[in-house]
């Protein structure tokens, strides 16, 4: 019957994620009992995405690799609301890599998921970015301006933020 086949589909979908995410936290979306959205435990959720704060100190390339083995990417921030959500889980004395880089050092910033870089939706600290050798972006806290972005050398180890689409079952 319909419910049985739906359950079988859900189980096979869950098996796909089991290698890196042995536990999922799911919530019912809307009123329909058949629509569940899930994030790996202990990731946090906001709108249609899941977020993970990685506390290991890694270069930008390795931070992105670390996210990718979990089925995610370094975070792409699309709105002020999204950034406001993310910063609730960050420590003020730490810096975190974003999925934003300038590989050629020509100030052509690009997001890891190919989302177009929009100058109007950026949250650089004042005076940033300021160095052509600093080709990767972090988010950090400055007492004068709170949370914002800064360019940094990609090899300097930092913490990072991973983002993935919610898993719908």
């Amino acid at each position: 019957n319909f419910m049985y086949s739906k359950t079988v589909k859900r189980l096979s979908k869950l098996r796909e994620y089991q290698q890196y995410h042995p536990s999922l936290t799911c919530v019912m979306e809307g009123k329909d009992i058949e629509d569940w959205s899930c994030c790996p435990t202990p990731w946090t959720s906001f709108q249609s995405s899941c977020y993970f704060i990685s506390t290991g100190m890694q270069s930008w390339t390795k931070s992105q690799k670390n996210c990718s083995v979990m089925g995610a990417d370094l975070v792409v921030i699309n709105t002020r609301e999204e950034q406001d959500f993310i910063i609730q889980n960050l420590k003020r004395n730490s810096s975190y890599f974003l999925g934003l880089s300038d590989p050629g050092g020509r100030r052509h910033w690009q997001w890891v998921d190919q989302t177009p870089y929009n100058e109007n939706v950026t949250f650089w600290h004042s005076g940033e970015p300021n160095n052509l050798d600093e080709r990767c972006a972090i988010i950090n806290f400055r007492s004068s301006e709170e949370w914002g972005w800064n360019d940094i050398h990609c090899h300097v180890p930092q913490k990072s933020i991973c983002k993935m689409k919610k898993i719908y079952i």
Partner: antibody, heavy 118, light 107 residues
Framework: QVQLVQSGAEVKKPGASVKVSCKAS????????IHWVRQAPGQGLEWMGT????????SYNQKFKGRVTMTRDTSTSTVYMELSSLRSEDTAVYYC???????????WGQGTLVTVSS | DIQMTQSPSSLSASVGDRVTITCRAS??????LAWYQQKPGKAPKLLLY???TLAEGVPSRFSGSGSGTDYTLTISSLQPEDFATYYC?????????FGGGTKVEIK
């Protein structure tokens, strides 16, 4: 050609501090991270931390946090590693190494022997 | 922190021998591994990086392989100048720890 030239040997008393220098030449000093690695007599290698000469950003091995400070002087293309509260176990050869584009240590200094003895 | 366990700690071999040194990481280091050669009183010299890429100027008798947690350095035909101590080092996340070293001595 790329060269990292370190300061000379030091003898220090327990509790004192030592500051070792590493002068870089043959490349753009501010574009590459410098790491510090030490080696106790007859022992293996131990990573201490790194500094980015362009912005001064540092990352230290937790084992040395609070005792190690890495700084740089861009006018002389020199990086410094200062280790405080020295004890006999800190007797070692201290190396600086450049991290190349491939994110590995491609050039090393000749080493600086620091002896801690009362 | 990721620990690196290198074996053997020492070995005796003759010129022309094939020599294999292994390095095991306590976690997946995704091939971010370097091998160094060190001679007494000298700084380490980079031999291989990314587990299997030969550094500039390094003879082709040196090769590396492995993935995940297990890695190998092979010297296909040992030469007199290869008698030295060899170290592995991971670069996955800080601290970038080294293996304990393998001393290759003349038999």
């Amino acid at each position: 050609q790329v060269q990292l030239v370190q300061s000379g040997a030091e003898v220090k008393k327990p509790g004192a501090s030592v500051k070792v220098s590493c002068k870089a030449s043959g490349y753009t000093f501010t574009s590459y991270l410098i790491h510090w690695v030490r080696q106790a007599p007859g022992q293996g290698l131990e990573w201490m931390g790194t500094i980015y000469p362009g912005g001064g950003d540092t990352s230290y091995n937790q084992k040395f946090k609070g005792r190690v400070t890495m700084t740089r002087d861009t006018s002389t293309s020199t990086v410094y590693m200062e280790l405080s509260s020295l004890r006999s176990e800190d007797t070692a050869v201290y190396y600086c190494a450049r991290m190349g584009d491939n994110e590995y240590f491609d050039y090393w200094g000749q080493g600086t022997l620091v002896t801690v003895s009362s | 922190d990721i620990q690196m366990t290198q074996s053997p700690s020492s070995l005796s071999a003759s010129v022309g021998d094939r020599v294999t040194i292994t390095c095991r990481a306590s976690g997946n280091i995704h091939n971010y591994l370097a091998w160094y050669q060190q001679k007494p009183g000298k700084a380490p010299k980079l031999l291989l990086y990314d587990a299997e890429t030969l550094a500039e100027g390094v003879p082709s008798r040196f090769s590396g392989s492995g993935s995940g947690t297990d890695y190998t350095l092979t010297i296909s035909s040992l030469q007199p100048e290869d008698f030295a101590t060899y170290y592995c080092q991971h670069f996955w996340s800080t601290p970038y720890t080294f293996g304990g070293g393998t001393k290759v001595e003349i038999k």
